[in-house]
C-alpha cells in the first residue's frame, strides 16, 4: 500500500486583513482511516483551527466536499483575516485509536503572514 503523505504546497502565504485565506492540503492515501485536523503552531499549546470530525468553526469552510468517500483534499478557507491569524498552519492526519485517535502524520506547514494593505 502507498504510504500516506500530507502535502501542503505553500511554505508561505501572504494574506490581507479582512480577506479570505486558502490553506491547501491534500493527502496521497485514504488509509489509515481517521480524521484530518488543522492546527496553528506545534506542541501541546497548538490551536485547533478545524476538525473534520466535529466542532463549530464559524470562520472556516472546506474547499472540497469532505463527505465524498474518495476525498483527498482537506484544504480550508479562513474568512475575515485579522493580524491575530498569523502563524504556521499544519494539516494533520490522525489514525483511529481507542480511546483516543493517534497523530499519524503532519504536513510541513504553511506560514501565514500579512502582506501589503489593500490600497
Amino acid at each position: 500500500e502507498e504510504e500516506l503523505q500530507m502535502i501542503q504546497p505553500e511554505k508561505l502565504l501572504l494574506v490581507t486583513v479582512g480577506k479570505t485565506a486558502t490553506l491547501h492540503c491534500t493527502v496521497t492515501s485514504l488509509l489509515p482511516v481517521g480524521p484530518v485536523l488543522w492546527f496553528r503552531g506545534v506542541g501541546p499549546g497548538r490551536e485547533l483551527i478545524y476538525n473534520q470530525k466535529e466542532g463549530h468553526f464559524p470562520r472556516v469552510t472546506t474547499v472540497s466536499d469532505l463527505t465524498k468517500r474518495n476525498n483527498m483534499d482537506f484544504s480550508i478557507r479562513i474568512s475575515s483575516i485579522t493580524p491575530a491569524d498569523v502563524g504556521t498552519y499544519y494539516c494533520v492526519k490522525f489514525r483511529k485509536g481507542s480511546p483516543e485517535n493517534v497523530e499519524f502524520k503532519s504536513g510541513p506547514g504553511t506560514e501565514m503572514a500579512l502582506g501589503a494593505k489593500p490600497s
Epitope: L31, P32, V33, P35, T67, K68, R69, N70, K96
Partner: antibody, heavy 118, light 107 residues
Framework: DVQLVESGGGVVRPGESLRLSCAAS????????MSWVRQAPGKGLEWLAG????????YYIDSVKGRFTISRDNSKSSLYLRMNSLTAEDTAVYYC???????????WGLGTLVTVSS | ALTQPASVSANPGETVKITCSGG??????YAWYQQKSPGSAPVTVI????ERPSDIPSRFSGSASGSAATLIITGVRVEDEAVYFC???????????FGAGTTLTVL
C-alpha cells in the same frame, strides 16, 4: 430533532419501477452524506447506496448497480432512490439514513415497505 | 463480511459483550445498531468504534482492536432486549457492510 421520513413504498409487479423519497428535517441536510439501507423480511440489514452532501458522488453495492439510482435535492431536503426492473428479491423495508463524518449512520428513518409480487 | 454471534443472553444487571469480526483495523470503522422488532427503525447506539450518541445511555460502550469490534452493555436492562447489528465502513472499498445480527435476550 433529526427526522427522516420515507415514502413511496407499495406493491408493484416484477419488472416495474418505483421511486422512494426521504424527507429530512431538524438538521442541515446539505451538509450530510446520506444512504439507503434495506431489510428483507426475516433478514438483516443491507446497505444499497450512498450519496455525498453535494450530490456529485454516488456509491452502490454491486448487486444494485445500474438498476438503482440514488439522488438528492438539497433545496427540498429530500433524498431519493429510483428502483428499476424490480424482482421479488427486492421486497424489503427501505430505510434512509444520515451518515456520520466517516460514513457510518447516526439517524435512521422509520422505513417504507416495498413488496414486489405478481 | 462481518461475523457476529447469532444470540447472547444475560440476566438483568450483568455485563454483555457482543463481538464483531472481519474488518481490517487499518481501513474499517465500526458501529452498532439496535433494532427492537423486525422492520422497526434501527437506532445507532455506537458509531466510530466507540462513540456514543448523546441520547444513548452510558451503559452502552464500544471498542475496536485488531480485526474485531466489541459492544459492551454494562448493567443490562430488560429494555435492552433487541437485535444488535454491527456495521462497518471500509475506507479501502468505500462500502458499508453489516453483520447478520445478534439477538440479545435478557432473562
Amino acid at each position: 430533532d433529526v427526522q427522516l421520513v420515507e415514502s413511496g413504498g407499495g406493491v408493484v409487479r416484477p419488472g416495474e419501477s418505483l421511486r422512494l423519497s426521504c424527507a429530512a428535517s431538524g438538521f442541515t441536510f446539505s451538509s450530510h452524506a446520506m444512504s439507503w439501507v434495506r431489510q428483507a423480511p426475516g433478514k438483516g440489514l443491507e446497505w444499497l447506496a450512498g450519496i455525498s452532501a453535494g450530490g456529485s458522488d454516488t456509491y452502490y453495492i454491486d448487486s444494485v448497480k445500474g438498476r438503482f439510482t440514488i439522488s438528492r435535492d438539497n433545496s427540498k431536503s429530500s433524498l431519493y432512490l429510483r428502483m428499476n426492473s424490480l424482482t421479488a428479491e427486492d421486497t424489503a423495508v427501505y430505510y434512509c439514513a444520515r451518515e456520520t463524518w466517516n460514513h457510518l449512520f447516526d439517524y435512521w428513518g422509520l422505513g417504507t415497505l416495498v413488496t414486489v409480487s405478481s | 463480511a462481518l461475523t457476529q454471534p447469532a444470540s447472547v443472553s444475560a440476566n438483568p444487571g450483568e455485563t454483555v459483550k457482543i463481538t464483531c469480526s472481519g474488518g481490517d483495523y487499518y481501513s474499517t470503522y465500526y458501529a452498532w445498531y439496535q433494532q427492537k422488532s423486525p422492520g422497526s427503525a434501527p437506532v445507532t447506539v455506537i458509531h466510530s468504534d466507540d462513540e456514543r450518541p448523546s441520547d444513548i445511555p452510558s451503559r452502552f460502550s464500544g471498542s475496536a482492536s485488531g480485526s474485531a469490534a466489541t459492544l459492551i452493555i454494562t448493567g443490562v436492562r430488560v429494555e435492552d432486549e433487541a437485535v444488535y447489528f454491527c456495521g462497518g465502513y471500509d475506507g479501502r472499498t468505500y462500502i458499508n457492510t453489516f453483520g447478520a445480527g445478534t439477538t440479545l435476550t435478557v432473562l
